[in-house]
């Protein structure tokens, strides 16, 4: 299964820690992806270590653990964020976070 | 049936540098990641780097960072391995693999290309 | 990084005979583990992935298993056209790495 905070907050300019949790008794993880809305903005597996989308690049630091780092937040960076993780034997699981980025006070 | 056909054998000098292409016949580089391996004569497999080419993005071993450049062009499904500053010990048959991304990430390295033959020599 | 250690470095057979590779890691890496067979001459070639699934296209004679830091590669019944390298690999920890290989000869 797959846990996490399904609505966060932060603050304009600032950062945020995306992170999906996951627990199985039998199934191993070989590739998190992390998606916002529908365009990939993360992949990490161990043959491959972290990979991020070059137009992310400069405000997405991977981590800590399998999450990532969102900076410099920007009121467009407001929607849905996606991790899936893929797992052998076990299949496709996915968390789904709301992120609200509030102007600074 | 996806192959990885690799550009030919090379003889280079000490100090210069050799770039092996590896292309995608028949198919493309969509979910799939490229790894480098290389073999020096008489010795086993070790693991240079890695590219993602719908990022474009590369990792490398400690060993071979800041020497090796893997590249992709998603245009013509080809990645390219760059080595620099070459020495003797790099001597060795390099190959490109294929590594699937998503949901098939387990299946390791499924498809070799045939190997690139670099001899470096004064 | 994470050694892996294999055993024998060598070893002859005969046609017939069943076979046990070992691989050993320097720590636990669960059950990510591959095999892979490599002639003279030719790339290497995926035999098992996840330390026990079997490729596909890839006679039953060959099975894997273990998990954490042993593992094992089995020829039920070796075949004329098994003799060959045998290296096992770990992607539980990046970056990837191999061990020093098996050489099964013919006895």
């Known amino acids: 299964t797959i846990d996490t905070k399904r609505n966060i907050s932060a603050e304009e300019g600032g950062s945020v820690i995306l992170q999906c949790h996951f627990s199985s008794d039998t199934a191993e993880v070989t590739q998190v992806d992390w998606k916002q809305q529908d365009q990939l903005l993360a992949i990490y597996s161990v043959d491959l270590g972290w990979h991020v989308a070059s137009v992310f690049s400069d405000r997405v630091v991977p981590g800590p653990s399998l999450g990532l780092t969102f900076q410099s937040l920007t009121m467009n960076d407001t929607g849905e964020y996606f991790c899936t993780y893929h797992t052998y034997p076990g299949g496709i699981y996915k968390g789904r976070i709301f992120l609200k980025v509030q102007e600074s006070s | 049936q996806v192959q990885l056909v690799q550009s030919g054998a090379e003889v280079k000098k000490p100090g210069s540098s050799v770039k092996v292409s590896c292309k995608a016949s028949?198919?493309?580089?969509?979910?799939?990641?490229i790894s480098w391996v290389r073999q020096a004569p008489g010795q086993g497999l070790e693991w240079m780097g890695v590219?993602?080419?719908?990022?474009?993005?590369?990792n490398y071993a400690q060993k071979f960072q800041g020497r090796v450049t893997v590249t992709a062009d998603e245009s013509t499904s080809t990645a390219y391995m760059e080595l620099s500053s070459l020495r003797s010990e790099d001597t060795a048959v390099y190959y490109c693999?294929?590594?699937?991304?998503?949901?098939?990430?387990?299946?390791?390295?499924?498809?070799w290309g045939q190997g690139t033959t670099v001899t470096v020599s004064s | 990084d994470i050694q892996m250690t294999q055993s024998p470095s060598s070893l002859s057979a005969s046609v017939g005979d069943r076979v046990t590779i070992t691989c050993r890691a320097s720590?636990?890496?669960?059950?990510?583990l591959n095999w892979y067979q490599q002639k003279p001459g030719k790339a290497p070639k995926l035999l098992i992935y996840?330390?026990?699934s079997l490729q596909s296209g890839v006679p039953s004679r060959f099975s894997g298993s273990g998990s954490g830091t042993d593992f094992t590669l089995t020829i039920s019944s070796l075949q004329p056209e098994d003799f060959a390298t045998y290296y096992c690999?770990?992607?539980?920890?990046?970056?990837?790495?191999f061990g020093g290989g098996t050489k099964v000869e013919i006895k």
């Open positions: 693999a294929r590594l699937h991304l998503g949901q098939k990430a387990y299946y390791g390295m499924d498809v």
């Open positions: 720590q636990s890496i669960s059950s990510y």
């Open positions: 690999q770990q992607r539980y920890v990046f970056p990837p790495t």
């Open positions: 590219i993602v080419p719908i990022f474009g993005t590369a």
């Open positions: 028949g198919g493309t580089f969509q979910n799939y990641a």
């Open positions: 996840a330390a026990s």
